[in-house]
């Protein structure tokens, strides 16, 4: 870890506080050991150099120790997610020490001032950890810093300044403004802990990105591409409010990272898996559902430690609420065309039928365009566990659902008015489950009838385990 930029005094001088707060003799950073799940309980305030509170409050030197670090705030009161996270940690790790890092006086500022305060808060945490290290049995290996938004970068500074290396830092949608593209010593980065895992839920390539877009950890997970989170759209958020603003959407998407992490703690039996991929578009095409060579991982608390030479970007889809887990499928469809299709893009839907349940009708998202006489790959996901897949219904939507499609159809007709009808042939569909890594092949129910046209459907039944590839070995990954 690089050394701190200056002596402690210099760091204290950096504090950006209103005049009224500067005269305070009380510390601007407080460490509250949450000794009980009861929110009414005052907990214990830890004070550097004072061992008595540690003993009085039953600080467990050999147990895991979590430091929860909030971010910038527009309020003098903790946001509600904090209680949920503390409670979830207590539920999952009963013997653990859960410490809330309260830096509200320094975070409840102009954003730029709060950013400038992150370094000194990180330094305060590092000093607390250095002091705890002097105690018998306390190990930095057992320390897990969890930082939300600006708090993620505070965790980075803490990991940077501490003597030694903390076990883990989880960045929950680390803040973007003033950190995007910054030097590694001025933001959360992989060398701040033995394992740095990051969830990105509010990244935008246009306008202001509240969350950082660049990968900053050993693994960087981008649920739903890291941008638009289900259940956070204007309609979802404003539709249920008497008064609503875009702020609610921002809060919903930015804070989703916290709720995904909470979900990983409380719904251990429903873990969500993310898959390594170079970019969001390739993931949306269904290309990246491999678990070979550590290419998939659980998200949140259950993430397995991976220290790659370079950042690993991982993607997954989620539900709109807890439990967030979905089941991912890669679908490979070889499309034959015996007739000139023109420019029209088919709108395909699939329904999956399994031993446990049947899916809803799912759209096949066409990321670029359907390649004719070629194999097209799609990503579909279901909210329920279907069990073993038995059959698939493929539908080509008839009536146009958008002006854009209508225009394309009209243009296609004008260019080929005598085209007797649009028709595609599909003989089989190959499916791979992301969660089980199982591969299956589905063949057209009627081998004599493999053609599909608008308003029509085709049925496919499972015809073999695995894919029609010679000598292919497909190790099934046992995931919990």
């Amino acid at each position: 870890s690089p050394t701190p930029f200056g002596p402690e005094g210099q760091l204290e001088d950096e504090l950006h506080k209103p005049k009224a707060i500067q005269t305070e003799v009380k510390p601007s950073v407080r460490f509250n050991l949450r000794t009980s799940k009861d929110p009414e309980h005052e907990g214990c305030y830890l004070s550097l150099g004072h061992s008595q509170p540690l003993e009085d409050c039953g600080f467990n030197m050999t147990a895991k120790t979590f430091f929860i670090i909030h971010g910038w705030t527009m309020s003098g009161i903790f946001e509600n997610w904090l209680h949920k996270l503390v409670s979830a940690l207590h539920t999952r790790e009963k013997d653990a020490n859960v410490v809330v890092v309260d830096w509200l006086p320094l975070a409840h500022q102009l954003y730029t001032d709060a950013v400038n305060n992150t370094r000194v808060v990180g330094h305060s945490i590092a000093r607390m950890l250095d002091w705890l290290q002097e105690k018998d049995d306390f190990s930095l290996e057992n320390v897990h810093l969890i930082g939300y938004s600006l708090g993620a970068h505070v965790a980075g500074y803490a990991g940077n300044f501490v003597k030694g290396t903390v076990g883990r830092i989880t960045g929950l949608d680390p803040a973007g403004p003033m950190f995007e593209g910054a030097d590694i010593h001025k933001r959360l980065s992989p060398d701040d802990a033995d394992f740095v895992d990051v969830l990105h839920t509010y990244t935008r390539s246009f306008g202001l990105s509240i969350g950082i877009q660049m990968p900053v950890g050993h693994i960087d997970i981008y649920p739903n591409g890291g941008d638009f989170q289900p259940g956070c759209g204007l309609n979802d958020v404003l539709g249920s409010m008497a008064y609503g603003t875009i702020t609610e959407v921002v809060k919903c998407e930015h804070e989703r990272a916290v709720h995904l992490f909470v979900d990983s703690l409380v719904n251990q039996d429903k873990p969500s898996f993310a898959f390594q991929c170079t970019d969001s578009n390739r993931f949306k095409k269904g290309i990246c559902l491999s678990c070979r060579k550590n290419r998939c991982n659980s998200i949140g608390y259950n993430a397995k430690k991976m220290r790659n030479k370079r950042n690993s970007k991982m993607y997954l889809k989620t539900r709109a609420g807890m439990p967030f887990r979905v089941y991912h499928y890669q679908m490979k469809i070889h499309v034959f065309s015996y007739k000139n299709m023109g420019e029209i893009e088919p709108t395909f839907y699939v329904t999956l039928y399994g031993t446990n349940a049947d899916s809803q009708t799912l759209p096949l998202e066409i990321v670029e365009r359907i390649e004719q006489n070629a194999t097209n790959t799609f990503l579909v996901y279901t909210e329920e566990d279907l069990g073993d897949l038995l059959k698939i219904q493929l539908t080509w939507e008839g009536a146009s659902q958008s002006w854009y499609n209508l225009w394309k159809e009209l243009r296609s007709y004008l260019s080929q008015p005598h085209n007797p009808g649009r028709e595609l042939n599909i003989r089989r569909i190959r499916v791979k489950s992301g969660e089980t890594q199982r591969k299956l092949t589905f063949c057209a129910e009627d081998p004599e009838n493999t053609s599909i046209s608008p308003g029509r459907e085709l049925w496919f039944r499972k015809c073999r385990d695995g894919w029609r590839m010679k000598n292919e070995t497909s190790p099934t990954v046992e995931l919990p």
Epitope: P39, E40, H41, G76, N80, S87, H108
Partner: antibody, heavy 119, light 107 residues
Framework: EVQLQQSGPELLKPGASVKISCKAS????????MHWVKQSHGKSLEWIGG????????TYNEKFKDKATLTVDKSSSTAYMELRSLTSEDSAVYYC????????????WGQGTTLTVSS | DIVLTQSLATLSVTPGDSVSLSCRAS??????LHWYQQKSHESPRLLIK???QSISGIPSRFSGSGSGTDFTLSINSVETEDFGMYFC?????????FGGGTKLEIK
């Protein structure tokens, strides 16, 4: 024993201002947020806002942003709410309530201060 | 703002009966819901916090359940001292809001 003692009833004319007090005892005043709630006659409760006594940080219900100002005096463990430009709509019982550590639920309430605005 | 709806304005019960009071949120509020009892000319009193957590000093006949948007306060064998107004409150997002209340009265 935790206690929140509020100031007495007020009868004021429209346009006036009033400062209601809430003196806390039985706990560390700076460790918990203090909230203010309005209850109009025979009606439900409305959250006005909350203050963090540790450093004076506040959060307001947008509806009361121009009406109420929350402050604290740490030396006397007292929270204050000032209401300005009073109208008959402000006639109500006002409660202070101690938040839990996260500020979410209110286990202790003051006895209420009745404010009557009448010309 | 999150709207909390207590569909029953008044509930008439006989002492000894068991009763359930409902509170519905206009959006998912997880478990961030609290229940209060208020008797005439008194301050509200916290009965249940965070949907189901009991409060010391509150009789065990009061219990809470629910998560997301639908919540219930149950009173097992109502006693005469239980009559009064019951309010729910959410702390999921600002501004914190209260339900319109349900009046529990003697039949």
């Amino acid at each position: 024993e935790v206690q929140l003692q509020q100031s007495g009833p007020e009868l004021l004319k429209p346009g006036a201002s009033v400062k209601i007090s809430c003196k806390a005892s039985g706990y560390t005043f700076t460790d918990y947020t203090m909230h203010w709630v309005k209850q109009s006659h025979g009606k439900s409760l409305e959250w006005i806002g909350g203050i963090n006594p540790y450093y004076g940080g506040t959060t307001y219900n947008e509806k009361f942003k121009d009406k109420a100002t929350l402050t604290v005096d740490k030396s006397s463990s007292t929270a204050y709410m000032e209401l300005r430009s009073l109208t008959s709509e402000d006639s109500a019982v006002y409660y202070c309530a101690k938040g839990d550590y996260y500020g979410g639920s209110y286990n202790y309430w003051g006895q209420g201060t009745t404010l009557t605005v009448s010309s | 703002d999150i709207v909390l709806t207590q569909s029953l304005a008044t509930l008439s019960v006989t002492p000894g009966d068991s009763v359930s009071l409902s509170c519905r949120a206009s959006q998912d509020i997880s478990n961030s819901l609290h229940w209060y009892q208020q008797k005439s000319h008194e301050s509200p009193r916290l009965l249940i916090k965070y949907a189901s957590q009991s409060i010391s000093g509150i009789p065990s006949r009061f219990s809470g359940s629910g998560s997301g948007t639908d919540f219930t306060l149950s009173i097992n064998s109502v006693e005469t001292e239980d009559f009064g107004m019951y309010f729910c409150q959410q702390s999921n997002s600002w501004p914190y809001t209260f339900g319109g209340g349900t009046k529990l009265e003697i039949k």
